[in-house]
């Protein structure tokens, strides 16, 4: 009976069975029912789903473009993934917004002890952060290399300058 | 040029390219180039995008094929980042926009993202970057010092 209000009397390409399949697969990836999955496991998870929610590998760039919210520890909430995948199937519509709201309300109400979570970044932002981090890291390693070469050059000159003193 | 890219990079670029090659004809439009690059973590300005297009879209037909795209990305990856680009990169981690990053945040970013620095490298980085030891890094000054010839 999951999401029966959201999908009631609907001939949409998404039905109750698809949501049940999502949660059945989710349980395998989140056996402790934390509601979160590590970003590093997301690619495997969405590849394991059945159509129409599945995003087959290679899917890393696709997942980046979904711009999923992430919380500290690079974890993603199951609802955010489900919303994004649902949106991929249904497209961006008023119906999608209504479905999302219904699903979210039902989910939160069904799990009243769970703490609300504050996303700090998204998959798209994280990719940008990765690229920016690499720029800084390469610049710093270049700087270290140049500095050690300068030191080596200085030591070399210094040792050769002093060699003719005898 | 493209032989300087790793297998992993080429696979990633291929995936991004294919994702936006909607009709599967092996080309993307120059309009889509920005979207493709953003999905790869790049944030090119309109002017930069135009320069890249001018370089690779020789016949000016408004489309780019994968080999051209690879060449373009390889050029972009090979270029040594300017002082301004490195400053921009730091700015991404400056959540308050006040010109400072905490040493703790810098350590976290440098050891967890990208081409991760070793503990020794990051210790040395923070020694150089947090000059007065107050736990805050003025990255403007640090970038100048790093890029000084």
């Amino acid at each position: 009976e999951n999401f029966n209000v959201a999908t009631e009397e609907s001939s949409e390409p998404l039905g109750e069975d698809d949501f049940e399949m999502f949660y059945e697969t989710w349980e395998k990836f989140d056996p402790d029912a934390t509601q979160f999955i590590a970003y590093s496991r997301l690619s495997d998870f969405v590849d394991t789903l059945q159509e129409p929610l599945r995003i087959a590998k290679p899917n890393k760039i696709k997942l980046i473009t979904l711009d999923l919210p992430m919380v500290p520890g690079d974890k993603i909430h199951c609802l955010d993934i489900l919303f994004a995948l649902t949106k991929e199937v249904l497209g961006d519509s008023g119906e999608m917004d209504a479905l999302k709201q219904t699903m979210e309300e039902k989910f939160m109400a069904a799990n009243p002890s769970k703490v609300s979570y504050e996303p700090i970044t998204t998959t798209l932002k994280r990719k940008h952060e990765e690229v920016c981090a690499i720029k800084i890291q390469r610049a710093y390693r270049r700087h270290l290399l140049q500095r050690s070469m300068k030191q080596a050059s200085y030591m070399y000159r210094h040792s050769h300058d002093g060699s003719g003193d005898d | 040029m493209a032989d300087q890219l790793t297998e992993e990079q080429i696979a990633e670029f291929k995936e991004a390219f294919s994702l936006f090659d909607k009709d599967g004809d092996g080309t993307i439009t120059t309009k889509e180039l920005g979207t493709v690059m953003r999905s790869l973590g790049q944030n090119p300005t309109e002017a930069e995008l135009q320069d890249m297009i001018n370089e690779v879209d020789a016949d000016g037909n408004g489309t780019i094929d994968f080999p051209e795209f690879l060449t373009m990305m390889a050029r972009k990856m090979k270029d040594t980042d300017s002082e301004e680009e490195i400053r921009e990169a730091f700015r991404v981690f400056d959540k308050d926009g006040n010109g400072y990053i905490s040493a703790a945040e810098l350590r976290h970013v440098m050891t967890n993202l990208g081409e991760k620095l070793t503990d020794e490298e990051v210790d040395e980085m923070i020694r150089e970057a947090d000059i007065d030891g107050d736990g805050q890094v003025n990255y403007e000054e640090f970038v100048q010092m790093m890029t000084a010839k």
Partner: nanobody, 124 residues
């Protein structure tokens, strides 16, 4: 085994109040999320309210928010539903449900434990 027993239903006038109770046994009550759901004749069962084990505020459906209050007494292993300003459309069989708070479910329908229900009729 786990048992949930609702009580407190009956006939009440529009605008009146009623308090439902649900006594639980066979579970570690303090570790369980608890919910109230209702079903009117010919309609689907609908969520009314839920309360967790943490200090999170309870959840209410839009149709009862501001009129109904859910509460729990861990010592008495009982969950309550205080219903004020009752309307004829609140008439239904009211069910109590429970699940382990550490387990995540998609909707209230997935709660494993349910009571038999108590009838509330709002009529003049």
């Amino acid at each position: 085994q786990v048992q949930l027993q609702e009580s407190g239903g009956g006939l009440v006038q529009p605008g009146g109040s009623q308090r439902l109770s649900c006594a639980a046994s066979g579970l570690t009550f303090a570790n369980y999320d608890l919910a109230w759901s209702r079903q009117a004749p010919g309609k689907q069962r609908e969520f009314v309210a839920s309360i967790g084990v943490t200090r999170n505020p309870p959840y209410y459906s839009g149709s009862v928010k501001g009129r109904f209050t859910v509460s729990r007494d861990n010592a008495k292993e009982t969950v309550y539903l205080q219903m004020n300003d009752l309307k004829p459309e609140d008439s239904a069989v009211y069910y109590c449900a429970a699940k382990d708070a550490s387990v995540t479910v998609a909707t209230i329908e997935d709660y494993p434990y349910w009571g038999r229900g108590t009838q509330v009729t709002v009529s003049s």
